[in-house]
Interface confidence: low
């Protein structure tokens, strides 16, 4: 999907590659003439979409699910974008400079021009992972963003991953060919599901409250610098480093990879004629191509690949998960013939590893990705990727494994270090994850600069005390991951209304409130009665949130979904919700009882999106000694009074009173989303 | 009204060293980091030293490194730069900014949101 | 390495809008930047900051006339219905922290005209 930069990937004819097909030739010189137009991107399929948004049918039922307290971390304490299989297929005109030195790799331009309806993707996928989410899961997705010309409300990564784990030749195709990999950590079991911050444009923008500074922040107390809390060390002057410096590995030129043996150089002209029309777009002339080649050389290594391409660019046209099949098939069907070149080899298998994770067949991928490892034992990014194969299946024990093999063996290789860092903090291995994490980031490395991780250094840093946090947070606001340092959900829309606190008038829900404020003995009553009756239907907070304490909730609409079996025990309640689609409709939210019980500190934490607003009833509330800080503005509870956040802003909660204490949480939309999106943004 | 002031500009032969400084008002000094930027007669703006609200962190670009060294007075509200082994290429108008906020506050810590007027510094001999 | 690329002059007549980009390199291309401008004889004056979505916080004094917006790694400032105190040069920032150390690099300036 790719708008490439001709000039990094060819070297230097690149510049004058006016139209775009990756060599210089009579139609740029035409284009540079002014005699013919520059060629644009035709859409592609945003590849997102290769996991259904909407919940399986045949998921557990909701009262069977593993409760997701306050939700946030859910998808978020843990989801984290890396860039998988850079630049899997190969340029045209390798066929005909074959031996020709390669340009510098092609920096990943993450701007995609698509439409984004999503009835008009590939057709239902059939995902090999479970699409229920705990704690510490892996996703894979592939970013893309909104053209804003639609009006479109898909959610949309705009994570900004420009470059990649393996720099070599690119396809000059606008592919977005290295599938973007969030991973989420579970506890047991992968996650197929993108990972999104929305493009959806919104045309007032209103900045949030930090944007004005705040003279006293009860958070931050100590020296008020922008910079590092610890005494820093001057870098010292550039030595001669090996290439862990990624700009010193952009430096290192690659060779050209070899893509034809023997064989293959004596019938070239057929098959430069043949990636031509591929390359030119003529998708269906270019299959019909490749098959008359392998049908005539059934023992072209390159024909076949050839062909593998062409499906695969056919799929996306056609928006077909079964052509794709196809291609996968075809890639594979290129390594198992003889002589097939080790650079064309890799080139199809890695392609192979990235379609099967675009299916959601990650233990296909996994198995390519190991098959490729035993073939390149000594390609680091082969094993980085294999490590996120295991991610993806959430073994994160083998991915481990890989991650301290790699770092064996080139102990400043970033992209492993966030990597293994992140598996340690999901192992609760809090204070060890961090020198990774942050040393990973500092790398620059390819897949390291990524919200993520960010996100990850700096929960770890809070949660040993360290303040340098906040310097993460800023850093990864600096850097486009994080909407602010308070607010950093990750599946966000846009220009949303961004505060921590907001009154019932400003939300509109007044309504409901009311309603809520009305009826809130009502409320509490079925509350207590189900405490009392069917303690086991408060489910404890699994998500490793608190410091301490004992926390559980019992949930009655997830994911806009009404869970029978909970509303039995609340029916009134229930009945009373139902007026309120805002909450009951709220995809991205929940309604549930809250009961959190003395000595009990929730870490500070941030949720999911920006998507909702997050109301408190008060039901049962000691005296003194619990309190909820959203922001820099700690506020108490009351009963029969509603309270209501955006929990997409860092919020902490400390229960210290002598007894417990109860309160009804009812998300609802965010107020200036408008109905199309609220219909169409996938739930959370 | 926030002010800053330059001072202590003005010719030095090549080799040679100077000291000027940067007078703050209207805001709490110690709460922000404080950069000094330079402006070459080409009209380039190269920014040449920040340091940290409470003095305990400074950065410099890799061409300045070693002959430029900026310090900060909180007490005095007054902000330094001392420039060493001048050269030719060190002549521009230099300003003193006020660079952002803490954390969890603004979130523009980067933005040079107010410049004093600048002081000249022309290296010849 | 952190680059802010800029055109280096630009006309507009009286009363017409002007947008004046500021392209990062694709790297960095998520990164918010900041925009100054300065009127001849004058320090430079902090405008506004830009984020990769287009919302913008604007400095003090700075009139409504003057709004940001981003597409991809170009940084907008656009001034509808321009005036003569407007003619100046309008230079971009960015800063970053690399492995601990802060770094601030502005763009070349587009120097504009109104006439």
């Known amino acids: 999907f790719d708008l490439v930069d001709y000039e990094e990937v060819l070297g230097k004819l690149g510049i004058y590659d006016a139209d775009g097909d990756g060599d210089f030739d009579v139609d740029d010189a035409k284009v540079l003439l002014g005699l013919k137009e520059r060629s644009t991107s035709e859409p592609a399929v945003p590849p997102e979409e290769a996991e259904p948004h909407t919940e399986p049918e045949e998921q557990v039922p909701v009262e069977a699910e593993p409760q997701n307290i306050e939700d946030e971390a859910k998808e978020q304490i843990q989801s984290l974008l890396h860039e998988m299989v850079h630049a899997e297929h190969v340029e045209g005109e390798d066929l005909q400079q074959e031996d020709g030195p390669t340009g510098e790799p092609q920096q990943e331009d993450d701007e995609f021009l698509m439409a984004t309806d999503v009835d008009d993707r590939f057709e239902t996928l059939e995902p090999e992972v479970s699409h229920e989410e705990t704690e510490h899961s892996y996703h894979v997705e592939e970013t893309v963003s909104q053209d804003c010309n639609q009006d479109m409300e898909e959610m949309m990564s705009e994570q900004e991953n420009p470059d990649s784990s393996e720099p070599v030749v690119e396809d000059e195709r606008l592919h977005h060919d290295t599938d973007d990999v969030t991973y989420q950590v579970y506890e047991e079991q992968a996650v197929y599901e993108p990972l999104e911050n929305e493009g959806i444009e919104i045309t007032e923008v209103t900045a949030p409250p930090e944007d004005n500074p705040v003279e006293d922040s009860q958070v931050i107390v100590e020296e008020v610098s922008i910079f590092p809390v610890e005494e820093q060390q001057e870098v010292p002057p550039e030595t001669n480093r090996k290439t862990d410096d990624p700009e010193q590995k952009a430096k290192v030129k690659k060779k050209k990879p070899k893509l034809l043996n023997k064989f293959d150089k004596t019938i070239k002209a057929e098959l430069d004629a043949a990636e031509k029309l591929r390359k030119r777009g003529k998708i269906e002339e270019a299959v019909n191509a490749f098959k008359e080649l392998v049908r005539k050389y059934p023992q072209s290594p390159r024909a076949r690949y050839g062909k593998a391409q062409c499906e695969d660019d056919l799929a996306e046209k056609r928006r077909s998960n079964e052509v794709l099949r196809g291609a996968i098939e075809t890639y594979q069907e290129v390594a198992s013939l003889p002589d097939v070149p080790a650079d064309l080899l890799k080139l199809s298998l890695k392609r192979r590893s990235d379609r099967q994770q675009f299916l959601g067949h990650m233990r296909g991928s996994l198995l390519t990705l190991q098959r490729l490892v035993q073939l390149f034992p000594n390609d680091t990014s082969l094993k980085n990727d294999l490590g996120v194969g295991y991610l993806l299946i959430g073994d994160n024990d083998n991915a481990k494994k890989v991650y301290e093999e790699v770092l064996s063996v080139t102990p400043n290789d970033g992209f492993a270090k966030v990597h293994y860092g992140f598996i340690l903090k999901a192992q609760n291995k809090i204070a060890e994850s961090i020198p990774y994490l942050k040393e990973g980031i500092e790398s620059g490395d390819p897949g390291t600069d990524d919200g993520r991780f960010y996100f990850h250094l700096g929960d770890a840093m809070q949660r040993v005390g360290n303040k340098e946090a906040y310097k993460w947070y800023e850093l990864g606001h600096k850097r486009g991951h994080f909407a602010s340092v308070w607010q950093r959900s990750l599946y966000n829309v846009n220009g949303l209304k961004a505060q921590p606190w907001w009154t019932p008038k400003e939300t509109g829900y007044t309504e409901l409130v009311k309603s809520l404020e009305r009826n809130w003995k009502l409320i509490r009553d079925e509350g207590l009665a189900v405490m009392d009756k069917a303690k086991g239907l408060f489910l404890p907070e699994d998500e490793n949130l608190r410091e301490k304490g004992d926390w559980s909730q019992f949930t009655l609409w997830q994911q806009g979904r009404r869970n029978e079996n909970a509303c039995k025990g609340a029916p009134k309640t229930c009945t009373l919700l139902e007026k309120f689609p805002e909450t009951t409709g709220c995809r991205r939210g929940q309604i549930k009882y809250s009961i959190m019980h003395p000595g009990t500190h929730v870490w500070p934490h941030t949720g999911p999106t920006n998507c909702r607003l997050r109301m408190h009833l008060g039901l049962v509330i000691p005296k003194e000694g619990c309190k909820i800080r959203c922001a820099n503005e700690t506020r108490t509870w009351e009963e029969g009074k509603v309270l209501i956040f955006d929990d997409s802003f860092e919020h902490e909660v400390w229960q210290d009173a002598s007894s417990f204490r109860l309160i009804f949480i009812v998300d609802v939309w965010h107020p200036e989303l408008t109905p199309q999106q609220r219909r169409s943004l996938p739930a959370i | 009204e926030v002010q800053l002031v330059e001072s202590g500009g003005g010719l030095v032969k090549p080799g040679g060293s100077l000291k000027f400084s940067c007078a703050a008002s209207?805001?709490?000094?110690?709460?922000?980091?404080m950069p000094w930027v330079r402006q070459t007669p080409e009209k380039r703006l190269e920014w040449v030293a920040t340091?940290?609200?409470?003095?305990?962190?400074?950065y410099y670009p890799d061409s300045v490194k070693g002959r430029l060294t900026i310090s900060r007075d909180n007490a005095k509200n007054t902000l330094y730069l001392q420039m060493s082994s001048l050269r030719s290429e060190d002549t521009a108008m230099y300003y003193c900014?006020?660079?952002?906020?803490?954390?969890?506050?603004?979130?523009?810590?980067?933005?040079?949101?107010?410049w004093g007027q600048g002081t000249s510094v022309t290296v010849s001999s | 390495q952190l680059v802010l690329t800029q055109s280096s002059s630009a006309s507009f007549s009286l009363g017409a809008s002007a947008k004046l980009t500021c392209t990062l390199n694709?790297?960095?291309?998520?990164?918010?930047i900041e925009w100054y401008q300065q009127q001849p004889l004058k320090p430079p004056k902090y405008v506004m900051e830009?984020?990769?979505?287009?919302?913008?916080s604007t400095g003090d004094g700075i009139p409504d006339r003057f709004s940001g917006s981003s597409s991809g790694a170009d940084r907008y400032l656009s001034i509808s219905n321009i005036q003569p105190e407007d003619e100046a040069i309008y230079i971009c920032?960015?800063?970053?922290?690399?492995?601990?150390?802060?770094?601030?690099?502005f763009g070349g300036g587009t120097k504009v005209t109104v006439l």
């Open positions: 900014a006020r660079q952002g906020n803490y954390y969890g506050s603004s979130h523009l810590y980067y933005a040079m949101d107010y």
């Open positions: 209207g805001f709490t000094f110690s709460r922000y980091a």
């Open positions: 340091i940290s609200s409470g003095g305990s962190y400074t």
């Open positions: 694709s790297q960095h291309r998520a990164y918010t």
């Open positions: 830009l984020k990769k979505d287009g919302s913008h």
């Open positions: 920032g960015v800063g970053d922290t690399i492995k601990e150390q802060f770094v601030y690099v």
